[in-house]
Amino acid sequence: AITEAREEAKPYPLFPGPFPGSLQTDHTPLLSLPHASGYQPALMFSPTQPGRPHTGNVAIPQVTSVESKPLPPLAFKHTVGHIILSEHKGVKFNCSISVPNIYQDTTISWWKDGKELLGAHHAITQFYPDDEVTAIIASFSITSVQRSDNGSYICKMKINNEEIVSDPIYIEVQGLPHFTKQPESMNVTRNTAFNLTCQAVGPPEPVNIFWVQNSSRVNEQPEKSPSVLTVPGLTEMAVFSCEAHNDKGLTVSKGVQINIKAIPSPPTEVSIRNSTAHSILISWVPGFDGYSPFRNCSIQVKEADPLSNGSVMIFNTSALPHLYQIKQLQALANYSIGVSCMNEIGWSAVSPWILASTTEGAPSVAPLNVTVFLNESSDNVDIRWMKPPTKQQDGELVGYRISHVWQSAGISKELLEEVGQNGSRARISVQVHNATCTVRIAAVTRGGVGPFSDPVKIFIPAHGWVDYAPSSTPAPGNADPVLII
């Protein structure tokens, strides 16, 4: 280990001025002693104030008690100021101060770069008592120094609630260059310039940088750290690293791959997650992104019917979350679906096409020409309609749903009837006399119930009340309320 004392043995004042970080002091006497001396005279004579005439010929009574020993200065003794050593070597340094015995329980603490060193540090304080003063030596040792041990170390001691601070001891740990910034992997556009940065520090300084591309040195002359390498452009992938050299040797950075951006590969595994009559939910696995993040994707949808005009619907979506619901499709139809995604360079090819089908839909139109009339003799209401025009994609008709609402004197009741698919007539029992009956009809497929027809109203005159229970079931004694003619 190299130990370097950068301070010369020079005279210093008997009572040196304030230490950095200590409480300010003043009125420094002008007497000085060699730095190597131990105890100082306390006040062998009365130093005069600058600019003040010395008081002469004053009859001062004789001092009866003479101090047995002069007091040491209330300051840490000067010590080595700068220690240079190699990594993993051991080091020991100390602070020493002599304190009058009246100041018992004084403790010395070690601080590094403004923070107190607590716990697992090898700090030992030894006390050497004399008649009137105790010499205190605080030692600090590091068995195997690391770069993190670099810094400014000081001792602090508290006397009368004042902090006495030592001169700093600078520890400089030297070793191989240490990277503070290494080149980063990059994805670049073909034939476009880019920069790589490499920075390494000692000590010892200076640190010089060489750049390496695909195992060959780029610069013949080293550059002082930090170094920026400007690469004019690449046409193919390359690996770069940097070498950092100082007097202790060489450190090589990690090798970083510089990739050339390209169009993405097509998505794979396009699959159907869910189908309804008018929508299909698809997912896909993105292909390789071509070293450039995906921006968005395009879903292409073609009708698979050979008789269709072959037009393609295009739906654009974000690249994430690799999921899209295609809407506004026809029911009971077959479609071919493909996905393509893009990055900053361009669009991928389309994925392999997949076939998908929508399910049956509910009818899209209501039954037509709904008519309602009263059959007074049988006390029934007859209903007639025309079958709605069936589109193939709506699905197979399975029947009709009839809604009839009876309104009289503030009472309103809705009943629903189901009718098979073959008829176009129905008969319902009169529920209330002196009331209005409102009828609506909807076609039904396996895909669901279609829209109801416009309401048709008929007035049932007052022939007397028909008794019915307040429910959707027919009144006792009555026949099934729906009759298909």
Partner: antibody, heavy 123, light 107 residues
Framework: EVQLQQSGPELVKPGASVKIFCKAS????????MDWVKQSHGKSLEWIGD????????IYNQKFKGKATLTVDKSSSTAYMELRSLTSEDTAVYYC????????????????WGTGTTVTVSS | DIQMTQSPASLSVSVGETVTITCRAS??????LAWYQQKQGKSPQLLVY???NLADGVPSRFSGSGSGTQFYLKINGLQSEDFGSYYC?????????FGGGTKLEIK
Amino acid sequence: EVQLQQSGPELVKPGASVKIFCKASGYTFTAYNMDWVKQSHGKSLEWIGDINPNNGGTIYNQKFKGKATLTVDKSSSTAYMELRSLTSEDTAVYYCARRRRYGNTYYWYFDVWGTGTTVTVSS
Amino acid sequence: DIQMTQSPASLSVSVGETVTITCRASENIYSSLAWYQQKQGKSPQLLVYAATNLADGVPSRFSGSGSGTQFYLKINGLQSEDFGSYYCQHFWGTSYTFGGGTKLEIK
């Protein structure tokens, strides 16, 4: 000009507490310890304790432990002393004083004194 | 605790005279002693620090001497503004005590 301006006179009842202050100006407040001194009427001076404005560390005269509490507010360069469980014995003038040290010696002194705060304890 | 004994307790002198006030410590306090002057109704003022050093602005007719256990404050040629009370104070150890004071009055 270095000055220590103290709070005005206080009349307090026995058993109560009082908090007096000492506002420093004309120097860097954290560079010197602040001490407090008691002077009963017609009597000598008694050192109460001191506070280090940097870290709030305090030292008390054994006699005033539990009686006085010293604090500082660095932002306003003000030192405070709270006196509790007051009795007629606590009737006095209380001074704050800036403490300095002579070079690197063990020789301290009070170079600037506050204006004094009179505390009267009476029912 | 270190005791500080100041003498005399009071002193009646004429303007122009020279006086010496004594302060005795119960144990060796080296030169850790200060002298203060206090006028009626006013705050104390520093005269001498570290036993022998005159504070800024203090007239040269004042002087301090002594070390160890025996200390002196001497005033040569008393002026009318010098009348008041004088206190010594030690700063040795961790509790600082004042002397009982000396009251200087005009004869």
